[in-house]
Interface confidence: low
């Protein structure tokens, strides 16, 4: 017996084929021995199968000798063994027909779980396998799961049925939801402006909900609300914003915060949280800022960082155009009686320099000035 | 070189708590991530609770509702406060610190949790 697979929703052609090649009369039944269709002649005429309405031939092929069943909008439960009567002959052919489906939603947000369920008709025992956009394979029965999916999950995933050395393939499209970056550092001197963008990581026709952006600085005992914000149809709207800091935030996407200066009291990490129309769960991005500042105090010249500095980075003094007067792996470093000239305070990480302050030393008898 | 030394560790009756210390040689606002890990014997190290920089926090499964991770940033220490504890909670319980621009995460040496029946 010959076995067909199919694909719930699609369209099967189950062939037929008599030695004449002319038009003859033939049947197609089900296994009930209930007749779908046949001909009279050169008329397509049906039988009171449930498959009425979805099932069709290809008259065009009749006067070859074959005499196709078409069946349209496949559902599991036309999972049979399907009988042509054609001459004196007697074709079966087995139709199994497979359904795979998401659960509930294809848009996941980031960490959470994708399963998959392969819907078959009783007495088969499929096995399955499915390919990520990343190319990760899992395996299954009829349910397989994926949990903490990441960024790199979306997109198209293949899905192979194998039944009976057949198979069958679904591509199921999964779009997860996420920022394009888990975190971010911003290195900025004391006064600049900072700019936080926070880009998504995928497109949607509309998006809609709401956010909030959190700030542990270091200095503080915990973390504070800097901002609240609406989202409505990817148009931005405050809700509420602290007076100190007093952020910006731009009308449109990206999400783009500004804050009119970097000051050591707000170094330190943000976590800026954003909650979906009909999702559950939340979108997280991480955000660092980290403050450099250079004085001069009598006869002392200071640098100093505050925020979340690893604790491999260097921070150095050193005259400009000349070696380094002192360098450590501290968040202040030094120099007593510095000579007259231009400093510079620089934050490098393997000696690539990440954020660098300049600042001039006068002859004693003057006062410092800051470029 | 950053340090983390972990407290607490014991035996403890089922349904008991106990409250976890790690301690650091440095500010914790330094660190991306500050969590808990956890290994019994004859077994792989899992993951039990994160909290991150900006104060986000994290559980596994096994321990929502149980677990509650917080910590003191006057002192840069983590706390891991455990109650309802059950025999499976055996393990010796580890202190980590993650550096987001650092391939390599910081741990502590350990604190011995056992929960008898």
């Known amino acids: 017996k010959k076995v067909v697979l199919g694909k719930k929703g699609d369209t099967v052609e189950l062939t037929c084929t008599a030695s004449q090649k002319k038009s003859i009369q033939f049947h197609w039944k089900n296994s009930n021995q209930i007749k779908i269709l046949g001909n009279q002649g050169s008329f397509l005429t049906k039988g009171p199968s449930k498959l009425n309405d979805r099932a069709d031939s290809r008259r065009s092929l009749w006067d070859q000798g074959n005499f196709p069943l078409i069946i349209k909008n496949l559902k599991i439960e036309d999972s049979d063994t399907y009988i042509c009567e054609v001459e004196d002959q007697k074709e079966e052919v087995q139709l199994l027909v497979f359904g795979l489906t998401a659960n509930s939603d294809t848009h996941l947000l980031q960490g959470q779980s994708l399963t998959l369920t392969l819907e078959s008709p009783p007495g088969s025992s499929p096995s399955v396998q499915c390919r990520s956009p990343r190319g990760k394979n899992i395996q299954g029965g009829k349910t397989l799961s994926v949990s903490q999916l990441e960024l790199q999950d979306s997109g198209t995933w293949t899905c192979t049925v194998l039944q009976n050395q057949k198979k069958v393939e679904f591509k199921i499209d999964i779009v997860v939801l996420a920022f394009q970056k888990a975190s971010s550092i911003v290195y900025k001197k004391e006064g600049e402006q900072v700019e936080f963008s926070f880009p998504l990581a995928f497109t949607v026709e509309k998006l809609t909900g709401s956010g909030e952006l959190w700030w542990q600085a270091e200095r503080a005992s915990s973390s504070k609300s800097w901002i609240t914000f609406d989202l409505k149809n990817k148009e931005v709207s405050v809700k509420r914003v602290t007076q100190d800091p007093k952020l910006q935030m731009g009308k449109k996407l990206p999400l783009h915060l500004t804050l009119p200066q970097a000051l050591p009291q707000y170094a330190g990490s943000g976590n800026l949280t954003l909650a979906l129309e009909a999702k559950t769960g939340k979108l997280h991005q991480e955000v660092n800022l980290v403050v450099m500042r250079a004085t001069q105090l009598q006869k002392n010249l200071t640098c100093e960082v505050w925020g979340p500095t690893s604790p491999k980075l260097m921070l150095s003094l050193k005259l400009e155009n000349k070696e380094a007067k002192v360098s450590k792996r501290e968040k202040a470093v030094w120099v007593l009686n510095p000579e007259a000239g231009m400093w510079q305070c620089l934050l490098s990480d393997s000696g690539q320099v990440l954020l660098e302050s300049n600042i001039k030393v006068l002859p004693t008898w003057s006062t410092p000035v800051q470029p | 070189e950053v340090q983390l030394v972990e407290s607490g560790g014991g035996l403890v009756q089922a349904g008991g708590s106990l409250k976890l210390s790690c301690a650091a040689s440095r500010s914790i606002l330094d660190f991306n991530a500050m969590g808990w890990y956890r290994q019994a014997p004859g077994k792989q190290r899992e993951w039990v609770t994160t909290i991150a920089r900006a104060g986000a926090t994290k559980y596994a499964d096994s321990v929502k509702g149980r677990f509650s991770i917080s910590r003191d940033n006057a002192k840069n220490t983590v706390y891991l406060q455990m109650s309802s504890l059950k025999p499976e909670d055996t393990a010796t319980y580890y202190c980590?610190?993650?550096?987001?621009?650092?391939?390599?995460?910081?741990w502590g040496q350990g604190t011995q949790v056992t929960v008898s029946s």
């Open positions: 980590n610190a993650r550096v987001f621009d650092l391939p390599n995460d910081y």
